[in-house]
């Protein structure tokens, strides 16, 4: 079956700068700023656009080894990034895949809001438990905070 879920996280970084760093340059930046979570991101095929496959290797101490993602759409104008987790122990034995739409919007008082809409595709009649969703949200938040800290410390970058 399918389970729809969404979450949002505020950031002090403006939308354009956050998208440029966290999304467009995330493959390089995230392993650099959060090596305790992700050790490497490798583009297996494609140039970063739709159809690109990324192999993400987690750091030691993280309960997952790797994840394989497929890029479905990159919308630079609207700060939107669509991708699907298609493989990896992160899916466990109950999930077939998970599609995410990450959208960064300007926040009214400055900064931005990172919105993630997810579609969990479970195998057969399996239910998607709340822990799985909470875990995904916490992981994304941890990476976002690491990027945020880096950007606050390196004000000349990604402008």
């Amino acid at each position: 079956g399918v389970f729809n879920y969404e979450a949002e996280t505020p950031s002090v970084i403006p939308a354009a700068r956050l998208f440029k760093s966290y999304v467009l340059d995330g493959d390089k930046l995230i392993p650099k700023v959060a090596p305790q979570v992700i050790s490497s991101v490798e583009n297996v095929g494609g140039n970063g656009g739709p159809g690109t496959i990324k192999n993400i290797t987690f750091a030691e101490g993280i309960p997952f080894k790797f994840v394989k993602e497929r890029v479905d759409e990159v919308d630079n104008a609207n700060f939107k990034y669509n991708y699907t987790v298609i493989e990896g122990d992160v899916l466990g034995d109950k999930l077939e895949k998970v599609s995410h739409e990450l959208k960064i919007v300007a926040a009214p008082g400055g900064g931005s809001i990172v919105k993630i809409s997810s579609k969990f595709h479970a195998k057969g009649y399996h239910e998607v438990n709340a822990e799985k969703m909470k875990g995904a949200k916490e992981m994304a938040e941890k990476l976002l905070r690491a990027v945020e800290s880096y950007l606050l410390a390196h004000t000349a970058e990604y402008n």
Partner: antibody, heavy 122, light 108 residues
Amino acid sequence: QVQLVESGGGVVQPGRSLRLSCAASGFTFSRYAIHWVRQAPGKGLEWVAVISYDGDDKYYGDSVKGRFTISRDNSKTMVYLHMNSLRTEDTAVYYCAKDGYSLYGKDYFDYWGQGTLVTVSS
Amino acid sequence: EIVLTQSPGTLPLSPGERATLSCRASQSITNSYLAWYQQKPDQAPRLLIYGASSRATGIPDRFSGSESGTDFTLTISRLEPEDFAVYYCQQYVRSPWTFGQGTKVEIK
């Protein structure tokens, strides 16, 4: 403007097959999931099936699983519902409906066709 | 599956009156993933509300949606003659996507 036009309904005997078509226009078809929803005479709405924007994912309601197959042709902006082993309880108006959210979809329906009536009777 | 129970089954009201329609879910609807549709005789349903409270394009502001826990409400502030119809709620949090059995708003 968004338009969905169903066709292919009619009277069919139990156990036989039928193929419904849904012709879409007025939106970027290849970016939206499409659903089939049916309504038995005098009854409420029942979700039947969905096909993802790229045709990779297909899901069905329990009452039609294993008998109905949904497919799409993005080049023709068409969606089809192949109905096999039809039963009298499949008698209904069948609507195709556009998902309200692009790409992965959110599974609510912002535009509906006018419906096509399928009558399963001996 | 998530079961949606609508009440009342029939709501007899006069034009100008306020209509309050209820939809109760058998389990939690995360992210307010609930929609409302209007259906008139021999017509297709029409989306009114999604996300429990967001009005769809072109829907007049006399239609509003709200939620409290697993209880969802569609309110029509002042009934117009064209509002007499059947109303359905639908959840889209987990498949199979399910509808309530409908509430008929009829002229008293």
